[in-house]
Amino acid sequence: IWELKKDVYVVELDWYPDAPGEMVVLTCDTPEEDGITWTLDQSSEVLGSGKTLTIQVKEFGDAGQYTCHKGGEVLSHSLLLLHKKEDGIWSTDILKDQKEPKNKTFLRCEAKNYSGRFTCWWLTTISTDLTFSVKSSRGSSDPQGVTCGAATLSAERVRGDNKEYEYSVECQEDSACPAAEESLPIEVMVDAVHKLKYENYTSSFFIRDIIKPDPPKNLQLKPLKNSRQVEVSWEYPDTWSTPHSYFSLTFCVQVQGKSKREKKDRVFTDKTSATVICRKNASISVRAQDRYYSSSWSEWASVPCS
Amino acid sequence: RNLPVATPDPGMFPCLHHSQNLLRAVSNMLQKARQTLEFYPCTSEEIDHEDITKDKTSTVEACLPLELTKNESCLNSRETSFITNGSCLASRKTSFMMALCLSSIYEDLKMYQVEFKTMNAKLLMDPKRQIFLDQNMLAVIDELMQALNFNSETVPQKSSLEEPDFYKTKIKLCILLHAFRIRAVTIDRVMSYLNAS
């Protein structure tokens, strides 16, 4: 058993039918010695008397808010949450596995640049009695500071019969140098509590591996005289790290017909312009990626050919 | 992904082309190592990230773009030994910081070259003959060092009398390749920045 925050305790349990459970001793936070009784949640049934209460915790019915009283007055509370260990693996019932880029990916994180700012998000089908708390650091043995805001509900979507809720959080490394070569990963830890169930999720990454630039901006077409060709030009996104000659991007230019089946023409360039053939009803799209470290491509920026 | 190759103009900063080749070569070698050593801990998540140049060179600090010198988090340590007279420096552009930066890159390459050659000698003794260092990568390191053209003492190749532990050698290869790829990215960024200056 360990303290999550004041008066809230987590009991770690080997979780299988008929498991023996854990013996827990609760102590009433009071100088009083006599006439103390204990109750659980809203029930008035007296579970025991005395300054300490010993209970065998085996299932969720044994968790909840234990209260010690004296003569009708509340002396203190202890909220017991359960952390399930199924066959030796901590349970992951609260969050959905996003399965990208691999199984057991519950937290996903992205950064728009090398400033040390990043966003993480996760999914759940649970809509009520749910709280999250996020902590982060650079490295774990001698952690360096990363400050995270509060997790907020950022999207709701319907998936089949279920509603899916997306939560996200923004974090900023306290003293980040964009040019630094990372040797210690960023660690992100999310505590999730649903009713009386506690779970924790972690993700470990280097900023360089979660970079996803914003799409190129100011995408423009300039028709070339007496030709079906057009000059496409664009600019680096405002959110990308500077100077651009150091933090360079590479670009992919795509000409896509109206039908998804039509052949796509693709050109790769390090410049911020390209000459392509614009077909009728086609659209031109451009996306960006770090030129030297192949993390994610940005989303496409698009303009119609007409 | 193969990086697009720009053919350097005669007047172009001459090391840019070599640094692009270096990044391509080390990236290919790392990819090959990850595939060949799939049952070894060789991914970024599995390895310890060690920098063999730590406390010996300070390439990131010495090569920091001017725009980032205002960022206090980037200014941990800016002192390092330096040598001037690299051939990548057009004489008009020679500056103290630039010479310091390029000499630091040269020292990095020299240290990695020694490590890789020592490691290759061990890998050649492996009866499994599972993996060797790509000669192209070693050649590209050499080419960039020649283009930088700094005079410095040659470091003797390390020789070891004890029987090599091939498992440990292969894990060390993965660690070295990951670190060298990160340094090659920094070198490429620096060359691109200097070329634009």
Epitope: Y16, K84, E86, D87, S91, D93, D97, N103, T125, I126 | -
Partner: antibody
Framework: EVQLVESGGGLVQPGGSLRLSCAAS????????MVWVRQAPGKGLEWVAS????????YYADTVKGRFTISRDDAKNTLYLQMNSLRAEDTAVYYC?????WGQGTLVTVSS | DIQMTQSPSSLSASVGDRVTITCKAS??????VAWYQQKPGKAPKGLIY???HRYSGVPSRFSGSGSGTDFTLTISSLQPEDFATYYC?????????FGGGTKVEIK
């Protein structure tokens, strides 16, 4: 006493469908992840699918992905396996399990 | 996928013997390994989880050990009711995979 009882097996033609059920008792079913495992005649054990408590996370073996669907009804204390596009190689005894307890199994035979 | 290679595939032993069954994973699975016992015509039953933890009610003569890639199930003193087929399983990553089984027969 913990009990898991499978039902719904039988003989089915290739391409056909079956729905297996597993009735659970003796424990708080809704609080536990559950799995289906199968065993072809005279062969070893093969994991088929898993479902977490609350159905938030579901995983399938590649051999059944897209054809089989695992689900649960916590109000009825029942685990299901909907099997579509059945093939001869799906012939096996299907067990539902919540370690260390396994059901007695139900035989599925796919044959024309 | 992670392969679990169990050995031997069968063995003959007498009551009172110490029996050791090994299981080798094709890659590191930490301690996320379970062992099962299956008697002819019956369902499997869980014996060990987390490589070395006995489920409640499993006799203490059964013990498990190992981590990473090499795992062992030991029956310290074979009893008549222990003649069965034993399977190891990794649950470190999906798909979950079982060993091919070890049949323990009476000598």
């Amino acid at each position: 006493e913990v009990q898991l009882v499978e039902s719904g097996g039988g003989l089915v033609q290739p391409g056909g469908s079956l729905r297996l059920s597993c009735a659970a008792s003796g424990f708080t079913f809704s609080d536990y992840g559950m799995v289906w495992v199968r065993q072809a005649p005279g062969k070893g054990l093969e994991w088929v699918a898993s479902i977490s408590s609350g159905s938030s996370n579901i995983y399938y073996a590649d051999t059944v992905k897209g054809r089989f669907t695992i689900s649960r009804d916590d109000a009825k204390n029942t685990l299901y396996l909907q099997m579509n596009s059945l093939r001869a190689e799906d012939t096996a005894v299907y067990y539902c399990a919540r370690n260390p307890y396994w059901g007695q199994g139900t035989l599925v035979t796919v044959s024309s | 996928d992670i392969q679990m290679t169990q050995s031997p595939s069968s063995l003959s032993a007498s009551v009172g013997d110490r029996v050791t069954i090994t299981c080798k994973a094709s890659q590191n699975v930490g301690t996320n390994v379970a062992w099962y016992q299956q008697k002819p015509g019956k369902a499997p039953k869980g014996l060990i989880y987390s490589a070395s933890h006995r489920y409640s009610g499993v006799p203490s003569r059964f013990s498990g050990s190992g981590s990473g890639t090499d795992f062992t199930l030991t029956i310290s003193s074979l009893q008549p009711e222990d003649f069965a087929t034993y399977y190891c399983q990794q649950y470190n990553s999906y798909p979950l995979t079982f060993g091919g089984g070890t049949k323990v027969e009476i000598k």
